[in-house]
């Protein structure tokens, strides 16, 4: 009779250990789904303010065609300035066009006046070929007016209304370009 | 927090090629873009190749041309396949995603390129 009430003892502690488990799962599964669900909040209340805001460009951002650049208020050399675009989900400035080159220019003009930007563009130190940072050529009439004469490495930037070059290490502003928005009105 | 895993390392002859792959999780609707680094003995960590979320790739000079940035559909996985290796690419590369906050990075593959 010791040994039934011996084993029936030791079932009901491998029991209360099985619900401890479940509880325990239930308790992390339970945590879990409200990581998830905060996760998804801050997603979903991300998406409806740009819903909401169904601007084409962010604030502070101006906008031409299907493009949105943003002219930045700090100083920094030509890789730092790529990393902040890339921050914002954007490029350095790739110009495409005489019109966008125009565009560009008069924006500049309005806000800040005759500063320089990086822009984009590097020189390959072998080759000496000017490429934009997704790997194409300029078109001809985009290519830097002046060479720089500089040992370390040449980056491109927009003054007034020229192209120029510059090491890449020296301080200037920086314009960043992205994709706007297509309206889905 | 966002997590990188990245895969694809190895040794491999000049001239040849590889592809890494970097996988986040967690919080990727923060990242706003995605890049590989690479770093080699000695020297400074340098942007190899970055790709938006809207799919505009950067690529540093030294790659263009050999390399290709790109992603899966869900943006969740970036790769970075890498043709005509030659020495001086031997790196630990490291995969970047870039916030407006923080920036978080992977623990790194190796390439070796060597006959």
């Known amino acids: 009779k010791l040994l039934q009430v011996s084993t029936i003892a030791m079932q009901q502690q491998e029991k209360l250990i099985q619900q401890e488990r479940a509880l325990l799962n239930f308790t992390e599964w339970k945590r879990s789904c409200a990581l998830q669900m905060k996760y998804c909040q801050a997603f979903m209340q991300n998406s409806l303010s740009s819903a909401h805001n169904s601007s084409p460009c962010p604030n502070n951002w101006i906008q031409n065609r299907e493009s949105c650049y943003y002219v930045s208020e700090i100083w920094s050399i030509w890789h730092t300035s790529q990393e902040n675009c890339l921050k914002e989900g954007s490029t350095l400035l790739q110009i495409e066009s005489k019109e966008e080159m125009d565009f560009i220019t008069g924006s500049l003009r309005k806000i800040k006046g005759s500063y320089d930007y990086w822009v984009g563009l590097s020189q390959d130190g072998h080759s000496g070929r000017w490429l934009w940072q997704d790997g194409s050529s300029p078109s001809p009439g985009l290519l830097p007016a002046e060479r720089s004469q500089s040992a370390n490495q040449v980056c491109g930037y927009v003054k007034s209304n020229s192209l120029l070059s510059s090491n890449c290490s020296t301080w200037k502003y920086f314009i960043c370009e992205k994709y706007a928005l297509r309206s889905s009105v | 927090d966002v997590q990188l895993v990245e895969s694809g390392g190895g040794l491999v002859q000049p001239g040849g090629s590889l592809r890494l792959s970097c996988a986040a999780s967690?919080?990727?609707?923060?990242?706003?873009?995605m890049g590989w680094y690479r770093q080699a003995p000695g020297k400074q960590r340098e942007l190899v190749a970055a790709?938006?979320?809207?799919?505009?790739?950067t690529y540093a000079d030294s790659v263009k041309g050999r390399f290709t940035i790109s992603r899966d559909n869900s943006g969740n996985t970036v790769y970075l396949q890498m043709n005509s290796l030659r020495p001086e690419d031997t790196a630990v590369y490291y995969c970047?995603?870039?916030?407006?906050?923080?920036?978080?990075w992977g623990q790194g593959t190796l390439v070796t390129v060597s006959s």
């Open positions: 967690g919080r990727i609707f923060s990242v706003n873009a």
């Open positions: 790709i938006t979320n809207q799919g505009a790739p």
């Open positions: 970047k995603a870039f916030t407006r906050g923080d920036d978080y």
